[in-house]
């Protein structure tokens, strides 16, 4: 059990107060983390509270300002990037968000040697992506879907691509579906380790159907937003990978990297690119039916100026029980011999573990094993491999950092974080300097987050980087809810849950229950992390019990649980929420006449299906921006889990798993349906179709739309949304205002 203290002890009981909705909406109890911007083995940059960019040297203990807040303010810079030769800094301003990761901005180059902005051959605006080479001060950037190269910031640019066209051809940046569902980045270009070569992706969206929606704005006529967006079964982007020599870019121009024959024989995706050396690159490809992935290692052929990807350097990863990988196919971490690598994939028992591949995947050496999962490889050095897992004490919702000594035989394993601040810290990530000389640990909870700096050789803590003292003080007079993480064993399935209990929780009393659900494939909601959020308020002030349950389809507990939902989305996720609710009722402190469920996105889909399950368990529920039919969602995501919506594949389950098919079953529940009209991700179409089906079935329901808001419902919409949902739940649970 993980119990979060309901308060920091304070003898003045009457000074304690419950959380308010205002606290949550104002972000009063938000926390800070400290991620060093590493620039060498022992130096990092950090933006100080007063906006100076400060360089810290861990070994000398010295720090100095490399860029003043005055310079930052002169161009209204909100971000910066130091060139590796430390001669220039780019300053980013006029940030304009596009999709989840992408944005455009204006860039200014500041010359640190003379303390002036570089004049002449200034960068165009707005730029879609810009980055320094890993060595020196070359610049690559994307402007109007074309890639440009500058040898020095003041030089004229060299134009690398010429065919870039809005919504048609994307060079060096992903299109919508690759950004959201495959790369999870705003960029699609990669410098080789010493900056000799630049690799980039070209996405051709010419044949992709377009989603169009109105953006109302303030004008007399609304604008129409058009996005090439492949829904399940639709035409997909066509991807090609090119590499150009940045020293002599005009010599032979960009050279295309060949696609493995077994991939190129049908529709496919490019999934990631990893440079190994300046003349060796590793590409990962995936069949459209996403159970076969190929890792291809390619070498530069000086004589032909081309890239050669021999079949002997193709490594196939295949899943027979589900899709390849977890959410994404994992990426390799190469060792110092520049050919062998470490990679996370399923072992014979169906748990994701680290494997060492020297020649073939069949001969892979398993590095970690057990009924838990390795989650991320942070760094491989000559003698150590650092990774995170949920092994410790068998809690899948924890993350600890481990070091395996690979320089000695047999390799020894050490948990770096397990006993550091055991009660406070059970969920870590890490950030390593060059050669892992030093590293920062960022602990996310369950206690108040803390960031610390450590020696990479001895693991000794050097200093606290951020401990959120102000937050700790602010929480001293707050009655926080209690949290516990436990598990239910039901029919050979383990259902981990987090329960958030009112501060004066009494097991002999009855409480209204709210289920918060996400439940998407390879997600995890039950995590040992700190949060003061809306559900904290509902428990603290409104006396609700809130529960989060990780059912079938969720991650980091083995393939049996993860792949249980393969080709059957919308079935077991819902069943497991219902099963958990029944178990909670059996615990004796839940008022079974006051049970609600809510979720956002995939969680909106699950909450809708749970409400329409006909069990009579739920009095009411809320779906925010739900998927309503898998035919409406993106191809890359949907087909990974559902296959294709064709008669000879899985059309039947696509049709059976819609919310609309269950419209009649909403008759006996109170349903609140919410969606942003400018949702580029889960299109408003999804909620429009639910509403239409409910109207056609003559079922009453409540709804709220947010004009011109996307999937995140940000800004003032957030306040309105949570206020509205609070009123809805309080009314459902007969709680006075």
């Amino acid at each position: 059990i993980v119990l979060r203290p309901s308060r920091v002890h304070n003898s003045e009981e009457n000074t304690m107060r419950a959380l308010t909705l205002k606290d949550i909406l104002n972000g009063t109890f938000s926390y800070k983390t400290f991620f060093p911007n590493w620039i060498s083995g022992q130096e990092y940059l950090h933006q100080s509270a007063d906006n100076n960019i400060v360089l810290y040297n861990i070994e000398t203990g010295q720090s100095y300002t490399i860029l003043s807040n005055r310079t930052m303010k002169s161009v209204n810079a909100s971000n910066y990037g130091l060139s590796p030769d430390r001669q220039f800094v780019y300053l980013e301003s006029d940030y304009s968000k596009l999709w989840r990761y992408s944005y455009t901005a204006t860039y200014y180059i500041y010359d640190l040697s003379n303390g002036e902005f570089v004049r002449g051959n200034e960068l165009p605006r707005p730029i879609q992506y810009l980055c320094w080479s890993p060595v020196g001060s070359k610049l690559a950037y994307v402007y109007q879907n074309n890639i440009y190269l500058k040898q020095r910031p003041g030089d004229p640019p060299f134009q690398i691509t010429f065919n870039g066209r809005e919504n048609k051809i994307f060079n060096g940046i992903p299109d919508w579906v690759y950004e959201e569902e495959m790369l999870a980045t705003k960029y699609a270009l990669w410098w080789s380790p010493n900056g000799k070569f630049l690799a980039y992706a070209e996405f051709n969206d010419t044949d992709i159907p377009v989603i169009a929606y109105s953006y109302y704005g303030d004008e007399q006529y609304p604008r129409t937003i058009n996005i090439p967006y492949p829904k399940a079964g639709a035409k997909n982007p066509v991807v090609r990978i090119f590499i150009i020599d940045t020293t002599y870019p005009a010599y032979v121009g960009p050279q295309e990297v060949p696609v493995p024959a077994m991939i190129a024989s049908s529709d496919y995706y490019f999934s990631w690119l990893t440079w190994v050396t300046d003349e060796r690159v590793c590409l990962q490809w995936l069949k459209r039916v996403q159970n076969v992935s190929v890792l291809s290692i390619c070498d530069f052929r000086e004589d032909w100026q081309t890239w050669d990807c021999p079949k002997t350097q193709e490594h196939i990863e295949e899943s027979r029980t589900g899709w390849a990988g977890g959410f994404f196919v994992s990426t390799p971490v190469f060792s110092y011999d520049a050919i062998s690598y470490y990679k996370i994939f399923s072992d014979k028992d169906g748990y994701k573990h680290i494997h060492y591949i020297k020649d073939t995947v069949e001969n892979a050496i398993q590095i970690t094993s057990g009924k838990w999962e390795a989650i991320n490889i942070f760094r491989v050095t000559q003698d150590s491999l650092f990774y995170s897992s949920n092994e410790f004490e068998e809690y899948p919702g924890r993350r600890n950092i481990y070091r395996i000594s690979i320089g000695s035989y047999p390799p020894s394993k050490k948990c770096v974080t397990c006993h550091l601040r055991k009660e406070r810290c059970q969920y870590y990530t890490a950030s390593f300097s060059d050669y892992a000389k030093y590293y920062a640990l960022v602990c996310y909870g369950p206690g108040i987050p803390i960031s610390t700096l450590h020696d990479g050789r001895t693991d000794q803590e050097i200093k606290i980087l951020e401990e959120n003292k102000e937050l700790e003080n602010a929480l001293k007079n707050i009655q926080l809810p209690k949290e516990e993480i436990k598990k239910l064993e039901v029919d050979e399935i383990t259902l981990w849950y987090k329960m958030i209990l009112p501060p004066q929780f009494d097991r002999s009393k009855k409480y209204p229950l709210l289920i918060q659900v996400y439940g998407g494939p390879c997600s995890q909601s039950v995590r040992s992390v700190f949060a003061v959020n809306w559900i904290s308020y509902l428990a603290s002030k409104e006396g609700m019990v809130i529960a989060l349950v990780d059912g079938r389809g969720t991650a980091f507990q083995g393939d049996k649980l993860l792949y249980a939902v393969y080709r059957k989305l919308g079935v077991y996720e819902v069943e497991d929420q219902i099963t958990a609710v029944r178990k909670f009722i059996e615990m004796g402190f839940i008022d079974e006449k006051r049970i609600a469920i809510w979720g956002w996105s995939y969680g909106g889909y699950v909450s809708s299906l749970a409400l329409a399950s006909g069990t009579g368990l739920f009095k009411c529920g809320i779906a925010v921006a739900p998927v309503s039919s898998w035919e409406y969602y993106a191809s890359v995501y949907t087909e990974r889990f559902m296959g294709l919506p064709t008669k000879d594949d899985n059309l039947e389950h696509y049709k059976n798993s819609t919310v609309m098919a269950r419209a009649e079953y909403f008759r006996n529940v109170d349903y609140l349906l919410i969606h942003g009209t400018a949702d580029d991700n889960v299109h408003f179409q999804n909620s429009a179709q639910i509403a239409k089906a409910l109207v056609n079935a003559q079922v009453d329901f409540q709804a709220m739309w947010y004009s011109d808001q996307n999937h995140g419902l940000s800004g003032l919409s957030t306040n309105h949304l949570y206020t509205h949902m609070t009123h809805f739940l309080k009314q459902c649970f007969s709680l006075s205002d």
């Epitope: 051959n121 402007y143 109007q144 010429f162």
Partner: nanobody, 118 residues
Framework: EVQLVESGGGLVQPGGSLRLSCAAS????????MGWFRQAPGKGRELVAA????????YYPDSVEGRFTISRDNAKRMVYLQMNSLRAEDTAVYYC???????????WGQGTQVTVSS
């Protein structure tokens, strides 16, 4: 949308001269920087000359400096490339291009072939 049509290409002996012309149509030509690119078989596309919006600033790579001259006539919506002392390595398809920012090109012509051979 801007349309560009090149002319003036052809076969010329080494040491000879050619003048390429490019006619622009579309409403925003005078806002644009203009340039000439070339692409030889099996090679990358290379910028050989560029001229700023006003004509006050020009750019040439070392390979053509002193031999090629770019000029523009905004009233006629024309851009020219005077090529002197031509060499065999100047053989390529030459493209006219325009862009909204200096040295950034968004619109392209279809190209005109220049062959330098004896």
């Amino acid at each position: 949308e801007v349309q560009l049509v090149e002319s003036g290409g052809g076969l010329v002996q080494p040491g000879g001269s050619l003048r390429l012309s490019c006619a622009a149509s579309g409403s925003i030509y005078d806002l644009y920087t203009m340039g000439w690119f070339r692409q030889a078989p099996g090679k990358g596309r290379e910028l050989v000359a560029a001229i700023s919006r006003t004509g006050g600033s020009t750019y040439y790579p070392d390979s053509v400096e002193g031999r090629f001259t770019i000029s523009r006539d905004n009233a006629k919506r024309m851009v020219y490339l005077q090529m002197n002392s031509l060499r065999a390595e100047d053989t390529a398809v030459y493209y006219c291009a325009v862009g909204q920012y200096d040295w950034h090109f968004d619109y392209w012509g279809q190209g005109t072939q220049v062959t330098v051979s004896s």
